[in-house]
Interface confidence: low
């Protein structure tokens, strides 16, 4: 990743330093571990999404826990705190991306194997919308490779 040189980038760096992204890391790690423990069902099926197309998504509390989280109050608390932290980045797409990249980098050593890494990455990509926030238009979540992340 290129180092930012703009004033806006320095503003983002100070935002990142102030932010506590640990609850996001804890929420995601618990989520993928729970998914692994469940009965082999597809953890990405749309029926398990915190928003349902039949609801008016703009009226829903963006911090309400996803159906997964009702099984673990701790995780629900992590998600709410995580969303509160990510909310600080919504008006700056580049900064939201930096925050997500930081989460990915912080957890990369704890992820066991390519499959778990891909799962973590998918959940991380979903995180902004689970919080009712806008996903960054471009964001490379690869930790070691220089190329852009593509499915």
């Amino acid at each position: 990743r290129q180092q930012w040189e703009l004033q806006g980038d320095r503003r983002c760096q100070s935002q990142l330093e102030r932010a506590n992204l640990r609850p996001c890391e804890q929420h995601l790690m618990q989520k993928i571990q729970r998914d692994e423990d469940s009965y082999g069902r597809d953890p990405y099926s749309p029926s398990q999404d915190p928003y349902s197309p039949s609801q008016d998504p703009d009226r829903r509390d963006p911090y309400s826990p996803s159906p997964y989280d009702r099984r673990g109050a701790g995780s629900s608390q992590h998600q709410e705190r995580c969303c509160n932290e990510l909310n600080e980045f919504e008006n700056n797409q580049r900064c939201m991306c930096e925050a997500l990249q930081q989460i990915m980098e912080n957890q990369s050593d704890r992820l066991q194997g390519r499959q778990q890494e891909q799962q973590f990455k998918r959940e991380l990509r979903n995180l902004p919308q689970q919080c009712g926030l806008r996903a960054p238009q471009r964001c490379d979540l690869e930790v070691e490779s220089g190329g852009r992340d593509r499915y």
Partner: antibody, heavy 117, light 107 residues
Framework: QVQLQEAGPRLVKPSQTLSVTCTVS??????????WSWIRQHPGKGLEWMGY???????YYNPSLKSRIAMSIDTSKNQFSLKLTSVTAADTAIYFC?????????WGQGTLITVSS | DIQMTQSPSSLSASVGDRVTITCQAN??????LNWFQHKPGTAPKVLIY???KLETGVPSRFSGSGSGTHFTFTISGLQPEDFATYFC?????????FGQGTKLEIR
């Protein structure tokens, strides 16, 4: 290779509802993190970004269209759709669907819809 | 909404020429800018993203620069296949907005 293809009636009468569907091939529309967008281009004019829908049904609409626009998603058909109510001649345009977020924005080739009696 | 002012609206040039198109935002968009190429009847294609990064597979004669509010797109050494319409798009804020487009024609 992911491809998007728009389909809809070429002609819509004023005051009626315009409907366009975008079929996605080469990727599941349920993949999280992407948003599926609609953009239009009036004849000889610039582009207007109309809004998006996430795979989970969450939407954002351009405030200039908010009272008339609705987007929906059909995961079983791997399609997403646009409806625009109370159309006038000013809604005559090429309608493009697109996939945005996380990587290269990917557009369909567009479909021209004319509003005329 | 963020207004994107693109100029010129049309441009005549010859094969081998160097051409430059500019896009100006009415507020800071950092580097959240795409440059697209569009040919009638085809899907618009991203050439440059994040204001200056070359999209995979795009020839190096295309380049972009700028940050904040002023952005430039350059084609060095025009090729016959480059005659098309080019437009910028900001994705820093919702709703995303576009420049009016520049039609590049053969002189």
């Amino acid at each position: 290779q992911v491809q998007l293809q728009e389909a809809g009636p070429r002609l819509v009468k004023p005051s009626q509802t315009l409907s366009v569907t975008c079929t996605v091939s080469g990727a599941s529309i349920t993949i999280g993190g992407y948003y599926w967008s609609w953009i239009r281009q009036h004849p000889g004019k610039g582009l207007e970004w109309m809004g998006y829908i996430y795979s989970n049904g969450r939407t954002y609409y351009n405030p200039s269209l908010k009272s008339r626009i609705a987007m929906s998603i059909d995961t079983s058909k791997n399609q997403f759709s646009l409806k625009l109510t109370s159309v006038t001649a000013a809604d005559t345009a090429i309608y493009f669907c697109a996939r945005e977020a996380w990587e290269t924005p990917l557009w369909g080739q567009g479909t021209l819809i004319t509003v005329s009696s | 909404d963020i207004q994107m002012t693109q100029s010129p609206s049309s441009l005549s040039a010859s094969v081998g020429d160097r051409v430059t198109i500019t896009c100006q935002a009415n507020q800071d968009i950092v580097n959240s800018l795409n440059w697209f190429q569009h040919k009638p009847g085809t899907a618009p294609k991203v050439l440059i993203y994040d204001a200056s990064k070359l999209e995979t597979g795009v020839p190096s004669r295309f380049s972009g620069s700028g940050s904040g509010t002023h952005f430039t797109f350059t084609i060095s050494g025009l090729q016959p296949e480059d005659f098309a319409t080019y437009f910028c798009q900001q994705y820093e804020n919702l709703p995303h907005t576009f420049g009016q487009g520049t039609k590049l024609e053969i002189r």
